[in-house]
């Protein structure tokens, strides 16, 4: 066979050619276009392998280059004014011949974020190394070059030509040479598939003898999607060789007659095609024996078949039909598994959300996290749940147990807490005394005071009604008990005594604010918001002064 001068690979329904040339991307595209093609697409790993094969052919035809790295244009470009789009596999680039964006990509490195200039893609090759099938050339993005200035390391380009279909290469039954001329003006004698509309020139004979015959064939569409040369029987047959030369040009079996003639035949499960050379499988799948979305796979020699199911399905007992696989049987999820047709999904229990290491993992939802706590006061996160708590002087309330309600200590089950008057406040209480009596230092008892005709001492003045958070400690003829929000440790003795501020003035209260409530001598205070330390009150003087505070992370801490 003569040495091919051009690099060409044909497979599927396309041919790829590789060329040397320090050209801009536009010049390279024009050369491909002149022959009816475009700069090559690389839309799949399979196509990347075809492109690599044609580049390997090109490199074999040329001595090793001095340059180590070389670049070859392919048909991936991003127009001027279109920005890089990192969310897409092609990053905003598109194939020059049109066609859909595909998920396959093989970028050399992270792309630069640009919008202004047109950008073009080349395949980056180490020209000093042989191209290995496992290491497909990487995609390199850069300027598209201009005439006379192709860009750094640009060595050539790859074209792609698409066809309706392909013919099998012609097989010779005796000495001879086949030369194919493709529609894209490439000549080759070693194509694994020959594109539709190619011409085959067959020269039979040893070459140096006068007995050479010439045959000319065209690859035609004989029937829809059936491509054939229109030749009949092996070419260049010679009685001298019989079946000994290239198996007589037969695809499978070659049978010799006594007179030096021979015939081609096929193995069981195959049939001889009209060219009397090629064998095709007697397709056991033609009767569509597989059901339920199963694919029929012909067995060897066309004798039998197997049915194959899509992912997530398996064959039933008949081995012909597909049924859903219950993936949940294998417990692939951390918590809940829901089987779906052909697949499954993982779900998390209430109080958990997807996350954590591994597929289908769940992690606890921190219901108490900053800004999301459902509790009115204290919140404690637990695995898969949470619970609310209330400061001392409040109890959990509400249907869902997230609210806090004030405890009225003045009507508590333990009996009167104060010797005389008792004033309930938000989260606390205070003691007071009737006119003529003053509150003893213990904040609970009353002692005889200077004779006075005024109202009882104790409840706050009208001006304190509805007092705001952060206000000063109200008049201290009343006192607050030592406890949680006002500072007591949780181990406060059960006999609680209110705190009395040492510098608080003793004030009188208009009689109309006093109204009998409950047993004689027990009085209720008008609705007043008593500021606790947690909401900005001053720290009470005297007694225990431990104050509940809140840390940056939203947790409670002791100051």
């Amino acid at each position: 066979t003569g040495a091919d001068t051009e690099a060409v690979v044909c497979a599927g329904t396309a041919c790829y050619t590789a060329h040397w040339g320090k050209l801009s991307a536009a010049e390279a595209q024009n050369l491909c276009l002149q022959n009816g093609g475009n700069l090559a697409t690389v839309k799949s790993e399979e196509e990347a392998q075809h492109v690599q094969q044609v580049l390997a052919q090109l490199l074999r035809r040329e001595a090793a280059l001095t340059a180590r790295m070389g670049k070859f244009w392919i048909g991936l470009q991003r127009e001027k004014g279109k920005c890089l789009d990192p969310s897409l596999p092609l990053k905003g680039f598109s194939w020059v011949g049109g066609g859909e964006d595909t998920p396959y990509s093989n970028w050399h490195k992270e792309l630069r974020n640009s919008c202004i200039s047109k950008r073009c893609v080349s395949l980056l090759l180490d020209l000093s190394q042989p191209l290995l099938p496992g290491r497909l050339p990487k995609w390199s993005e850069g300027p598209c070059g201009s005439p006379g200035s192709p860009g750094s390391n640009i060595e050539g380009f790859v074209c792609k030509f698409s066809f309706k279909g392909m013919c099998r290469p012609l097989a010779l039954g005796g000495p001879g040479q086949v030369t194919y001329t493709t529609p894209f003006q490439t000549t080759s004698s070693s194509l694994e598939a020959v594109p539709f509309a190619s011409a085959a020139n067959v020269a039979c004979g040893e070459g140096d003898k006068d007995d050479s015959q010439s045959h000319y064939f065209l690859c035609k569409e004989k029937a829809p999607d059936v491509f054939d040369w229109g030749s009949s029987g092996p070419l260049c047959v010679s009685p001298k060789y019989g079946c000994n030369f290239n198996n007589g040009g037969c695809h499978q079996d070659c049978f010799e007659g006594g007179d030096g003639s021979f015939l081609c035949g096929c193995r069981p499960g195959f049939r001889l095609l009209d060219d009397l050379v090629t064998c095709a499988s007697r397709n056991p799948c033609s009767s569509s024996p597989c059901r339920g979305g199963a694919t029929c796979i012909p067995g060897p020699h066309g004798k039998n078949y197997t049915c194959r199911c899509p992912q997530g399905y398996q064959l039933d007992s008949s081995q012909l039909d597909c049924v859903d696989v219950d993936e949940c049987q294998d417990s692939p999820c951390a918590q809940e598994c829901v089987n779906t047709p052909g697949s499954f999904r993982c779900e998390c229990w209430v109080g958990y959300e997807p996350g954590g290491p591994g597929e289908g993992a769940c992690q606890d939802v921190d219901e108490c996290a900053l800004g999301r706590s459902p509790c009115a006061q204290g919140c404690t996160n637990t695995e898969g749940s949470f619970h609310c708590s209330c400061e001392e002087g409040y109890v959990l309330a509400g249907e869902d147990g997230t609210q806090c309600q004030d405890v009225d200590e003045c009507v508590g089950p333990g009996g009167p807490l104060c010797d005389s008057l008792c004033f309930n406040t938000q989260g606390s209480f205070r003691c007071g005394c009737l006119p003529g009596w003053v509150l003893a230092p213990n904040g609970v008892s009353c002692a005889m005071g200077p004779v006075s005709l005024g109202p009882p001492s104790g409840p706050p003045d009208e001006e304190y009604k509805g007092e705001r958070e952060g206000s000063t400690v109200p008049p201290a003829a009343t006192a607050s008990p030592t406890r949680g929000p006002e500072g007591t440790p949780k181990s406060t003795p059960t006999t609680r005594r209110p705190l009395l501020s040492s510098d608080a003035p003793i004030t009188s209260v208009p009689l109309e604010v006093l109204a009998p409530s409950g047993s004689p001598g027990l009085w209720r205070e008008p609705s007043i918001h008593h500021t606790t330390a947690a909401s900005g009150a001053q720290e009470p003087a005297g007694g225990d002064s431990s104050v509940a505070t809140q840390n940056d992370d939203g947790t409670d801490g002791q100051k």
């Epitope: 001027k80 004014g81 279109k82 920005c83 890089l84 789009d85 990192p86 969310s87 897409l88 905003g92 630069r112 974020n113 640009s114 919008c115 202004i116 200039s117 047109k118 850069g142 300027p143």
Partner: antibody, heavy 115, light 109 residues
Framework: QVQLQQSGAELVRPGASVKLSCKAS????????MHWVRQTPVHGLEWIGG????????AYNQKFKGKATLTADKSSSTAYMELRSLTSEDSAVYYC????????WGQGTLVTVSA | QAVVTQESALTTSPGETVTLTCRSS?????????ANWVQEKPDHLFTGLIG???NRAPGVPARFSGSLIGDKAALTITGAQTEDEAIYFC?????????FGGGTKLTVL
């Protein structure tokens, strides 16, 4: 680290021209576009244009075509913007910013156009 | 020329999540608009936060994220901090030019 050092403040007469510079360091100058933005109290931030130092390709806001010219000197890793036929409306702080994602910004150059 | 609209001001509290949006007068914002988000702090200090819709710039804390929400570009700050108080600008690309929004003044109280 990446730095964009802009030239100092300019006081110019109406009708005159001025050339602002933006010296890049800490990265390969030709790897990223350089964009120019201006800020005024009236119009806020306005994109003027951008240049690809590798190819010299430019893009301009229609409003600034004829007003601004962008250039880049690869040897000194410096981008330039020339503003011409200045009026009081061109008084602003002018910024250079690296790449089409505006990741890094210069400190700005105050241009005051006054008679 | 297209008009890009942002909330003029937003207020949030430390630890809260806040989302700033960026609307285009020409229709839905898509990834081809390559939305950029820039932070301006006092003294004209600009920092790029997000480029190309959802790519965090080098050194930008993970609490900043970019996305498309409905027909708008969005910048979300998950767990805002007091130092995030600033003016935030978005810029959208329209085939051959960028257009900036008017900026959102974010207050973190």
């Amino acid at each position: 680290q990446v730095q964009l050092q802009q030239s100092g403040a300019e006081l110019v007469r109406p009708g005159a021209s001025v050339k602002l510079s933006c010296k890049a360091s800490g990265y390969t100058f030709t790897d990223y576009e350089m964009h120019w933005v201006r800020q005024t109290p009236v119009h806020g931030l306005e994109w003027i244009g951008g240049i690809d130092p590798e190819t010299g390709g430019t893009a301009y806001n229609q409003k600034f075509k004829g007003k601004a010219t962008l250039t880049a000197d690869k040897s000194s890793s410096t981008a330039y913007m020339e503003l011409r036929s200045l009026t009081s409306e061109d008084s602003a702080v002018y910024y250079c910013t690296r790449g089409a994602w505006f990741a890094y910004w210069g400190q700005g150059t105050l241009v005051t156009v006054s008679a | 020329q297209a008009v890009v609209t942002q909330e003029s001001a937003l207020t949030t509290s430390p630890g809260e999540t806040v989302t700033l949006t960026c609307r285009s007068s020409t229709g839905a914002v898509t990834t081809s608009n390559s939305a950029n988000w820039v932070q301006e702090k006092p003294d004209h200090l600009f920092t790029g936060l997000i480029g190309g819709t959802n790519n965090r710039a080098p050194g930008v804390p993970a609490r900043f994220s970019g996305s498309l929400i409905g027909d708008k570009a969005a910048l979300t700050i998950t767990g805002a901090q007091t130092e995030d108080e600033a003016i935030y600008f978005c810029a959208l690309w329209y085939n051959n030019h960028f257009v900036f929004g008017g900026g959102t003044k974010l207050t973190v109280l």
